[in-house]
């Protein structure tokens, strides 16, 4: 039975050219996290594997940095970075938990952070 919940940074906005931290946190479970995948739509951005550490997909290496923690930092943002991001927690014995973050990259400097919310 999957008892855990993923808390994410929710809907967030950031300024073009700036950077943003995508963060997820798995709670309410004692399951072991074996790997966390970060994906943008159908593209794999990065993997944090318990044994191997971080792997950043080659096409994102110059704009994506690992961390903090199991989070991901996106740099040199462009409007094309607007969209859905997913953190996928592979755990044992629970299975897979997925969190969703929507990022909007704004042209102006009115970007503000959205509220946090939980995905069961």
């Amino acid at each position: 039975m999957m008892t855990g919940t993923i808390e994410t940074t929710g809907n967030i906005s950031a300024e073009k050219g700036g950077s943003i931290i995508l963060q997820c946190h798995l709670s309410s479970t004692t399951a072991q996290v074996t790997q966390v995948n970060w994906e943008q739509q159908d593209q794999l951005l990065a993997i944090c594997n318990a044994d191997l550490g971080w792997h950043i997909s080659p096409s994102f290496k110059d704009r994506v940095a690992p961390g903090p923690g199991l989070g991901l930092t996106l740099q040199s943002l462009t409007v094309n970075d607007t969209g859905e991001y997913f953190c996928i927690y592979h755990t044992y014995p629970d299975g897979t938990y997925t969190g969703r973050i929507f990022l909007e990259v704004l042209e102006s400097s009115v970007a503000e952070h959205g509220a946090r919310f939980q995905i069961p």
Epitope: Q35, D51, H90, Y92
Partner: antibody
């Protein structure tokens, strides 16, 4: 701390059998893929066999197919390699190794954690 | 079976110098390539995977590059503990998973 401890090696005659064991500790054994990799004296590395976390799927190198069987007992945190019809060319140090992947993530078939190895000598 | 060929078989380098090791695959393995270091009497140690990603705890002086059939492991400034045998390994998503014959890096 991840630890893998092989045992069961020794001297066996050609055509004989041997069962190697690998006792795992320091991690949750159940979900992880495991492999056996061998190294003949003074030679390079050769992947031998692999098994999924559940034990439902196994893979073997052509050189040992039909003679060697990989298995696991997740309740005992132990990996096995049953070796039958042994040949002189099977003489090697046999390492067990932990895959970073699970049934959930998929398997990598690379290995960060290895045991210290157990020597199998096939000779008359 | 994909055949992995490493060159040179032996590389003589002075401490502090750069070492460049090559690995060639008989057919494309994309970026599914790992590098290991092995010292006498020890198990192999994973250095690099996905052709260029350092495994956890591996010093920055080790770097990997290449894709397809041609790969390189570079040790930017050899330390005394780096003298060892280095193996490349391909892990395309179906067996067998094959290793190169190894390159021995020795003190010049």
């Amino acid at each position: 701390e991840v630890q893998l401890l092989e045992s069961g090696g020794g001297l066996v005659q050609p055509g004989g059998s041997l069962r190697l064991s690998c006792a795992a500790s320091g991690f949750t054994f159940g979900p992880y893929g495991m492999s056996w990799v061998r190294q003949a004296p003074g030679k390079g590395l050769e992947w031998v066999s692999a098994i999924s976390g559940s034990g439902a799927s196994t893979w073997h190198a052509d050189s040992v197919k039909g003679r060697f069987t990989i298995s696991r007992d997740n309740s005992k945190n132990t990996l096995y390699l049953q070796m039958n019809s042994l040949r002189a060319e099977d003489t090697a140090v046999y390492y067990c190794a932990k895959d970073p992947g699970t049934d959930s993530t998929g398997y990598y078939y690379i290995w960060r954690y290895w045991g210290q190895g157990t020597l199998v000598t096939v000779s008359s | 079976e994909i055949v992995m060929t490493q060159s040179p078989a032996t590389l003589s380098v002075s401490p502090g110098e750069r070492a460049t090791l090559s690995c060639r695959a008989s057919q494309s393995v994309s970026s599914n390539l790992a590098w290991y270091q092995q010292k006498p009497g020890q198990a192999p140690r994973l250095l690099i995977y996905s052709a260029s990603t350092r495994a956890t705890g591996i010093p920055a002086r080790f770097s990997g590059s290449g894709s397809g059939t041609e790969f390189t492991l570079t040790i930017s400034s050899l330390q005394s503990e780096d003298f060892a045998v280095y193996y490349c390994q391909q892990y395309v998503p179906h067996p067998p998973f094959t290793f190169g014959g190894g390159t021995k890096v020795e003190i010049k």
